[in-house]
Interface confidence: medium
């Protein structure tokens, strides 16, 4: 059998506080426990949930937790079910509410000497006790013709007079706690001789040169006085108007009319009502001159088809606040649809190419109207007009590769060469239409080129291969002057390239044929043994079918190459003595000799008195100094070749002979003494 070890019991609970209804069962087999509230199963929520077999309340709620709770234990195998005793909460609570007018039915009906009843809408359990306040001061029951009914929660004033005017509030407390009125009531019972406001002037905004009207009315017994003042306390009457208010009229009903309003009329206007008794009532209203500033410019916008975009129109500063609307093609945009206005925004949903164009934001108020256009471009993916084609370009000439595309906005085109971006320089130029110009085509320009055309909507690309049609040219051009060594073997190369492999042949410039010891082997002129007669002018001719022929003229000189008869030797000289560096060369043409000392050429015309170069090429240096030490190079050259040889010159101090040393001992180096 199922036995309840602990049963839920009825208990006091506080609104919004924790509570627990206990339930514990014992049974031979497994049972599952659930709860009923007024016979209906209780569903777990974050506020009220099963905790083991017990029911836990995180925050008791007087409305949702009122009723009878029961714990039910059920054996799902046998079907046996047991129910606990009923339990309920005695929930204590208090809830704030406003002070309201119970009698008369409306504030307008409150008159001096009538009964006024106020009700305090604070409720709770147990029933709270109430306390009333006027202007924050507690009211005690039976004091100065008012009664407090705690049961009715009412405050009755009989009869009500001006002395009862004030702010009424109430508080209540019970065992649960205390609460004060959430909204208080202002009772105003005026003395009839006091001025009361019937109609208060309102702020007005007018356009320049328009008219403005302020209404102002007071009532009192006897009737009150009314006066208008402008900013600097200057009274405005029909008899005495200030200079800047010449066009002001005060009507019998108290209204003030200003015609042809100017900026100097803008400001604060005061309407003052004075009753027989009581303080004056001062009402203020401001006259604003309507104004509207210029609108900021829009940047042109580029959108992509299919997207959703918004353009915000910032209304210009103005008074009154300008109203804003969008137009397209002269038609005001609707507030819904695919292209519509939402607030100050222009909304384009699922943009189509046809949405491109000029949209105008308008702003207007009393001061006038402003407008600003925004140009909307709907970007499209570029399409081909002309793709780059595999091309044959001529070497040395300008070459063009097309990349003609169309799109909105105008696409940007970039070119790549062998996957490297081409930056414009002296050789490459990209025209506005996307065509690439290679200013002077080189052989190595023969490669892959790729152009990419892009807009914000996307890009397309294509590639082409360039074949360079080579110029018929010598590679390299033969040297126009060349030397051959007499009595030796010599070769003069000549090679050329072109669209087609050229044939190359040599001729003597005078047209005579080449002697038998001179052969022309695939462009190389070969002299088995050079003779004096081989000197002269020769022409290398390269030719092919498509390109014709080209010629290179070469003047061949036969020379005996330079040899040194006498070479300078390593020389050591005493300081102050003369050094002689000998050098003599032979060859044909006869070589000229130059000297280089200390890494600079010794110019014979600028040698000075200490140095001299003899006709045979020897160099003499008089009165040598330590700074003359160094390497000296003899350079022999003619029109055909150049040779050099070098030797060091050492300058030393003359030694003083020691006693032990015989006068005949030789120095440890070759010495020149003069």
């Amino acid at each position: 059998a199922i036995v309840f070890i602990k049963q839920p019991s009825s208990q006091d609970a506080l609104q919004g506080r924790r509570a627990l209804l206990r339930c514990e069962v014992e049974a031979p087999g497994p049972v599952h426990v659930y709860w009923l509230l007024d016979g209906a199963p209780v569903q777990d929520t974050e506020r009220r949930f099963a905790q083991g077999s017990s029911l836990s309340f995180a925050a008791v709620d007087r409305l949702q937790d009122s009723g009878t709770f029961q714990c039910v234990a059920r054996d799902d195998v046998t079907g046996e079910e047991a129910r606990s005793a009923n339990a309920s909460f005695n929930i204590k609570w208090i809830e704030a509410g406003p002070v309201v007018l119970k009698h008369p039915a409306s504030e307008a009906e409150i008159q001096p000497q009538t009964q006024v009843t106020l009700r305090c809408h604070i409720d709770g359990h147990p029933r709270p006790t109430y306390q009333w306040f006027r202007d924050g001061t507690p009211l005690s029951d039976g004091q100065s013709n008012h009664t407090v009914s705690s049961k009715e929660r009412n405050l009755t004033l009989r009869p009500a007079g001006p002395e009862h005017s004030g702010l009424y509030s109430c508080c209540a407390h019970s065992a649960f706690g205390q609460a004060c009125s959430s909204q208080n009531f202002t009772l105003s019972i005026a003395d009839e001789s006091f001025a009361r406001v019937v109609l208060a002037p309102q702020d007005v905004v007018v356009a320049r040169y328009e008219e403005a009207m302020f209404h102002c009315q007071f009532s009192a017994q006897p009737p009150p006085s009314l006066q208008w003042l402008f900013e600097d306390e200057t009274p405005i009457t029909n008899r005495s108007r200030p200079p800047h208010l010449r066009r002001a009229t005060v009507f019998a009903n108290g209204s003030l009319l200003l015609t042809q309003v100017r900026p100097r009329n803008a400001g604060i206007y005061r309407c003052i009502g004075q009753g027989q008794r009581g303080p004056p009532i001062i009402l203020e209203a401001t006259l604003h001159l309507a104004e509207i500033e210029d609108m900021p410019l829009f940047e042109p916008r580029v959108f992509t088809a299919g997207s959703e975009e918004r353009v915000t129109c910032l209304p210009p500063k103005g008074l009154p606040e300008p109203s804003v609307w969008w137009e397209h093609a002269g038609v005001r945009l609707p507030t819904h649809g695919r292209v519509y206005q939402k607030g100050h925004e222009l909304v384009l949903a699922n943009i189509a190419e046809s949405d491109a164009g000029v949209y105008t934001c308008h702003a207007a108020n009393l001061a006038g109207q402003r407008r600003q256009d925004v140009n909307i471009t709907v970007a499209t993916v570029p399409s081909w007009l002309k793709k780059p084609q595999d091309s044959q370009l001529e070497e040395g000439k300008p070459g063009y590769l097309d990349c003609l595309t169309q799109a909105t906005p105008k696409p940007t085109v970039v070119w790549y060469r062998n996957q490297m971006l081409i930056s414009e320089d002296s050789r490459f130029e990209v025209f506005k239409n996307g065509t690439l110009r290679i200013n002077s085509v080189e052989v190595y320009d023969g490669t892959w080129y790729r152009c990419m055309s892009s807009t914000p909507a996307g890009s397309i690309e294509a590639q082409a291969r360039v074949q360079v049609l080579e110029k018929l040219k010598f590679t390299p051009p033969p040297q126009p002057q060349q030397c051959m060594e007499f009595d030796k073997e010599a070769t003069v190369p000549c090679s050329a390239t072109g669209r087609e492999k050229p044939t190359i042949k040599w001729e003597r410039a005078d047209g005579s044929s080449l002697p038998e010891w001179v052969t022309d082997n695939a462009g190389t002129l070969h002299f088995a043994r050079v003779t004096r007669d081989d000197a002269g002018n020769y022409t290398c001719i390269a030719s092919n079918g498509p390109q014709g022929q080209i010629r290179a003229h070469v003047q061949l000189t036969v020379a005996v190459f330079i040899t040194f008869k006498v070479e300078p030797e390593r020389t050591t000289v005493y300081q102050g003595h003369t050094a002689l560096l000998q050098c003599e060369a032979q060859g044909d043409p006869k070589p000229l000799i130059q000297w280089k000392g200390k890494d600079r050429i010794l110019d014979p015309t600028k040698l000075g008195p200490r140095m001299h170069i003899f006709q045979n090429g020897s160099l003499v240096i008089h009165d040598v100094a330590p700074e003359d030490s160094g390497r000296y190079t003899c350079i022999a050259g003619n029109s055909c070749n150049i040779k050099h040889t070098e030797a060091p010159l050492y300058v030393v101090d003359k030694p003083v002979p020691e006693e032990s040393e015989g006068p005949g001992s030789p120095p440890p180096y070759k010495m020149i003494q003069t």
Partner: antibody, heavy 116, light 108 residues
Framework: EVQLVESGGGLVKPGGSLRLSCAAS????????MNWVRQAPGKGLEWVSS????????YYADSVKGRFTISRDNAKNSLYLQMNSLRAEDTAVYYC?????????WGQGTLVTVSS | EIVLTQSPGTLSLSPGERATLSCRAS???????LAWYQQKPGQAPRLLIY???SRATGIPDRFSGSGSGTDFTLTISRLEPEDFAVYYC?????????FGQGTKVEIK
């Protein structure tokens, strides 16, 4: 003496294929660009395709692009033209010609007839 | 592509007369790359002139070429019986290589 001899022409149905050959002799074949030029009956000359000496650069007329393939075998001194998806307007005498655009030597031609 | 237009379409002349054939290009190109060919019925074309004015090997000197830019001319100074044929101009400066439609020189 430079000689170019074409072969492989004949009658073929529209949509069919044919392979033309050109045997070259009398010059260094591997040094020259080679071409195919055709002439429709009673019409003028039309350049068809070109291949450079090393088969690096190949060009086609727009009218045959994607259908014809030019190739060469330098070891065999031979030039080829594989023609697929043939049309009636491809009917012509096909000449093999030597040169980089300048056709200095021509074969005697082979007739290709495309007809159903 | 460069379009070559030959004129006249047919030229009727007698042997011994001078023949002047014209070839006009749709765009300017280097005169180094204009050639003239002769074709007789049932034969392959034969190269006559290249580089606008250079005679190919074995071509008689009565054939001469001239012109530059877009206008080119082939002149046969004295027509021989064997010269009656169709003549084609061709540009080989830029692919696609293109031919003129031909001028037929026939016996009057």
């Amino acid at each position: 003496e430079v000689q170019l001899v074409e072969s492989g022409g004949g009658l073929v149905k529209p949509g069919g294929s044919l392979r033309l050959s050109c045997a070259a002799s009398g010059f260094t074949f591997s040094s020259y660009s080679m071409n195919w030029v055709r002439q429709a009956p009673g019409k003028g000359l039309e350049w068809v395709s070109s291949i450079d000496s090393s088969s690096s650069f190949i060009y086609y007329a727009d009218s045959v692009k994607g259908r014809f393939t030019i190739s060469r075998d330098n070891a065999k001194n031979s030039l080829y033209l594989q023609m697929n998806s043939l049309r009636a307007e491809d009917t012509a005498v096909y000449y093999c010609a030597r040169g980089t655009g300048l056709f200095d030597f021509w074969g005697q031609g082979t007739l290709v007839t495309v007809s159903s | 592509e460069i379009v070559l237009t030959q004129s006249p379409g047919t030229l009727s002349l007698s042997p011994g007369e001078r023949a002047t054939l014209s070839c006009r290009a749709s765009q300017s190109f280097s005169s180094s790359y204009l050639a003239w060919y002769q074709q007789k019925p049932g034969q392959a074309p034969r190269l006559l002139i290249y580089g606008a004015s250079s005679r190919a090997t074995g071509i008689p000197d009565r054939f001469s070429g001239s012109g530059s830019g877009t206008d080119f001319t082939l002149t046969i100074s004295r027509l021989e019986p064997e010269d009656f044929a169709v003549y084609y101009c061709q540009q080989y400066g830029r692919t696609p290589w293109t031919f003129g439609q031909g001028t037929k020189v026939e016996i009057k």
